[in-house]
């Protein structure tokens, strides 16, 4: 993978027709930031600027607008927002920040409401949104941020909303809060300094007994020469009811620990950007996948990492030792005193004593950190969001597939082989303006990922199998969603009955998978061409033989007959071979790719001259042929002839 990290095998530029994509936009609407999939998977609810939308995503192609309800910030709040020196152009609007399914008939939504957070229930009727009634709009402080640029997170668990956001206009008072439902409203205590003033929340993930919050904040427990940011996981118990005298209406089970995502001997990736849970059959083996960047730009470029954390490891750290603050030295050290009962954060049902609560107020930071497994480290890219799913290969093996949104508007599809580093199947540039990916939502039933941007929503089918036109290319792609169907001779999406199909997720080796009959027993190091393109030379013209670079992971060379053309003697320009008609120029030219130890012809040309036709090599007798015209340039100037066929670069 080199110092850059894995390269995407295939790259699609914005507007490249070879990657099936569709884009939803709506005149006058912007900031498609919040995405929610309906329980049946057929409707995508979208929180945009001053509106909530319901999109029908049942059919392939552009999502269809079912209906849209406006929810603008009121004139009163817009006026106040402008008075408070905020921008009427960019800030004094209602940016929808929370959108959750409350029950079968209602969504719950919150927005910034021109720096005056507000929430409301939205009634559903046959998955259509009913208009918002102004007398049903409630205070949303602690549920939505004031400022649209502030990070936030929220998750609905058992009818209660757990949210992490900024709780004041200035953006200096972070809060973790539980609202809705029958349990008492609970908050973190600002005065106890459980959270640093700059805490920035990126995810909330429920587990069996607790809810985990993922965030970054300035570290207080290290002596460092510059302000050091640190990533954290915090837990609160679902059954927490707050204290009776001490910690009234406050969490009594709040604990936090450091998350570590680093390669051995390297500076850590210390800024968490997003995290998701990939559930497993057994909760103990479930893992959390998180995207990190670093506050240090190595070599002047941003880099990103994806780390996996096991729930078991997180639980173990929260059951371990605490740190405590030495008031004299203002240093955090390991607490070595006696245990209190019930132990803070243990989710025991009984009422906690004043002694236990007093202890809890000061012992909320865990001594150990949760160490993640780095699965993907990539420089020159800043990942902003991720979505993760498990895909079953042809052999029944399970593969983790990650979809990673970047700060420049592209989507990376990464595959994590079992107990190994990730590789990148493809990179798709979605935004022509390099706008960042705001959100990602997997829609498994639709086989697609939806990516929210400032200007609209991209629907990205999870795989693009049909672009791999040969068995070799299909197998080398190592996309768990794709396999080669020898019958139809197509690379297709895996479906139910795929017995004779070809795929090699483990090695990605076409040598064993794609050869049939006697060749299977004695594999050849290079496969024969599938098609020969016949080209006629034109006197006094330079022929240009294009070679489409189908894979960024392959190395390419040209051969003439059975001999490799040396780099020194050939004129290769942008991958194309340039030929001057002269004696001995005719015959078979092949652009050969070598990838994963396997060589295969990407394109084969038979060059013939009008005055001296050549007999085709008998070994190639069975290979289909096609007469083509290639670009040519007259020697001594003149126009270049247009090719009949265009060759697309990846």
């Amino acid at each position: 993978t080199g110092g850059q990290g894995p390269m995407p095998r295939v790259k699609y530029h914005a507007g490249d027709g070879h990657r099936a994509l569709s884009f939803f936009q709506q005149k006058g609407l912007r900031d498609f930031d919040t995405l929610l999939l309906s329980d049946d998977g057929n409707t995508l609810y979208v929180g945009a600027r001053e509106a909530v939308l319901a999109l029908n995503i049942q059919n392939p192609g552009i999502p269809r607008l079912k209906n849209m309800i406006p929810w603008p910030a009121s004139e009163r709040k817009k006026t106040e927002c402008a008075f408070k020196k905020k921008s009427n152009e960019t800030q004094c609007f209602n940016f929808i920040r929370v959108l959750v399914s409350y029950n079968a008939t209602h969504l719950y939504a919150c927005g910034t409401f021109a720096f005056s957070p507000a929430c409301t229930f939205i009634e559903l009727q046959d998955s259509l949104l009913l208009p918002i009634l102004i007398d049903k709009v409630m205070d949303g402080k602690g549920q939505s941020p004031f400022d649209p640029v502030h990070k936030h997170t929220a998750v609905l668990v058992d009818g209660m909303l757990y949210s992490g956001t900024m709780n004041n206009f200035l953006g200096s008072e972070p809060i973790l809060m539980r609202t809705l439902g029958s349990q008492p409203v609970l908050k973190t205590d600002i005065f106890l300094r459980w959270l640093h003033a700059d805490a920035s929340f990126v995810a909330a993930i429920p587990s069996t007994q607790v809810v985990y919050f993922f965030f970054e904040e300035t570290a207080s427990e290290f002596d460092f020469f510059e302000e050091l940011y640190i990533s954290r996981v915090a837990q609160v118990c679902k059954n927490d009811v707050g204290g009776e005298k001490l910690l009234q209406k406050k969490w009594t089970t709040f604990l936090k620990a450091q998350l570590l995502c680093a390669q051995p001997g390297q500076l850590p990736f210390n800024i968490i950007r997003h995290a998701v849970l990939l559930p497993a059959d057994s909760p103990s083996v479930s893992r959390i996948y998180a995207v990190f960047t670093s506050q240090w730009q190595v070599g002047g470029t941003r880099s990103s990492a994806v780390c996996a954390f096991s729930l078991t490891d997180i639980e173990r750290v929260f059951k371990g030792k605490y740190k405590e603050l030495n008031k004299e030295t203002s240093r955090w050290t390991t607490y070595r005193g006696s245990e209190v009962s019930p132990r803070p954060g243990s989710c025991s049902m009984g009422p906690s004593s004043d002694k236990a609560l007093t202890f809890m107020k000061d012992h909320f930071l865990m001594d150990e950190h949760v160490v993640g497994t780095p699965l993907l480290v990539k420089s020159g890219v800043e990942y902003t969001r991720l979505a993760v799913e498990s895909a079953r290969g042809l052999d029944g093996s399970s593969h983790v597939v990650m979809y990673l949104g970047t700060s420049t508007g592209s989507l990376h599809k990464a595959v994590v082989p079992q107990d190994s580093s990730a590789y990148l199947v493809e990179e798709i540039q979605l935004s022509p303006d390099s706008e960042p990916v705001r959100n990602l939502q997997l829609a498994p039933a639709q086989g697609a990922v939806f990516a929210g941007f400032s200007g609209g929503i991209w629907r990205v089918p999870r795989a693009n199998c049909s672009v791999y036109e040969s068995c070799v290319d299909c197998v080398l792609a190592r996309d768990p969603h794709c396999a080669w169907d020898p019958e139809s001779r197509l690379c297709s999406l895996l479906s139910g009955s795929t017995k004779p199909w070809k795929q090699d997720m483990e090695r990605g080796n076409p040598e064993w998978v794609c050869t049939r009959g006697p060749m299977a027993r004695s594999p050849r190091r290079q496969s024969p061409p599938q098609l020969i393109k016949e080209v006629l030379t034109v006197p006094n013209s330079i022929l240009e033989l294009p070679c489409p670079h189908l894979s960024a992971l392959a190395s390419y060379h040209w051969s003439h007959g059975r001999a490799k053309i040396s780099e020194a003697s050939a004129t290769v320009y942008n991958g194309s071979l340039l030929l001057l008609p002269q004696d001995g120029v005719g015959g078979l030219y092949q652009c050969v790719a070598t990838e994963n130890g396997y060589s295969y012809p990407v394109v084969s040309y038979w060059v013939d001259s009008q005055d001296q036709p050549l007999a085709l090599d008998p070994e190639l007798a069975g290979v289909p042929r096609e007469r083509v015209q290639v670009p040519l340039t007259r020697v001594g100037g003149g126009a270049s002839m247009a090719a009949q066929r265009s060759y697309w670069p990846h």
Epitope: S74, E75, R76, K77, T79, F113, S116, A118, I134, K141
Partner: antibody
Framework: QVQLQQPGAELVMPGASVKMSCKAS????????MHWVKQRPGQGLEWIGA????????SYNQKFKGKATLTVDESSSTAYMQLSSLTSEDSAVYYC??????????????WGQGTSVTVSS | QAVVTQESALTTSPGETVTLTCRSS?????????ANWVQEKPDHLFTGLIG???NRAPGVPARFSGSLIGDKAALTITGAQTEDEAIYFC?????????FGGGTKLTVL
Amino acid sequence: QVQLQQPGAELVMPGASVKMSCKASGYTFTDYWMHWVKQRPGQGLEWIGAIDTSDSYTSYNQKFKGKATLTVDESSSTAYMQLSSLTSEDSAVYYCARDYGNFYYYAMDYWGQGTSVTVSS
Amino acid sequence: QAVVTQESALTTSPGETVTLTCRSSTGAVTTSNYANWVQEKPDHLFTGLIGGTNNRAPGVPARFSGSLIGDKAALTITGAQTEDEAIYFCALWYSNHWVFGGGTKLTVL
């Protein structure tokens, strides 16, 4: 129930300052703006200004800028108005009034009983 | 500065419907003026009745309603009662400040 308690009267010298209080109870103080209104004997009501109790942002009637300063103390759920450089023109009853108008409109529902300020040497 | 004008006095009988109005010197009153109606009873007892043109304050009897009639804001008391005898002030919002009217003295005879 909601109550806004104001001291009954203040007697102050011309040129001096006075700081009057408005203690709120029966609701979450920081959820509502607080308005201040002046009533001179035999005259109508004049709006002085208002304060957003959650972030101490203030909005003043141009006429009272420099004269009135609005503040809050969240811990005691109390709003304050300080009047400076007092003259006989400032002799009046001063009311605090809660704004219950939520997100969509302004509305003053609960009023204090007023503080009568007399400026006299 | 805008001037807000109200009837100086009105008289009604118990059970009758009476409408008090509020005019702005700058033109028609609109919902953006968030018309407020406040009742003053003896001993400086002020109570907010209506906010934002037509929103009744919590605990205010349903006989009080606010609206826009023509180019003015209006307070209507449907079935006036003797305890409604008071001075009623209207206040209008002008994008960054409030202006109160002079008040209407309502007598219920």
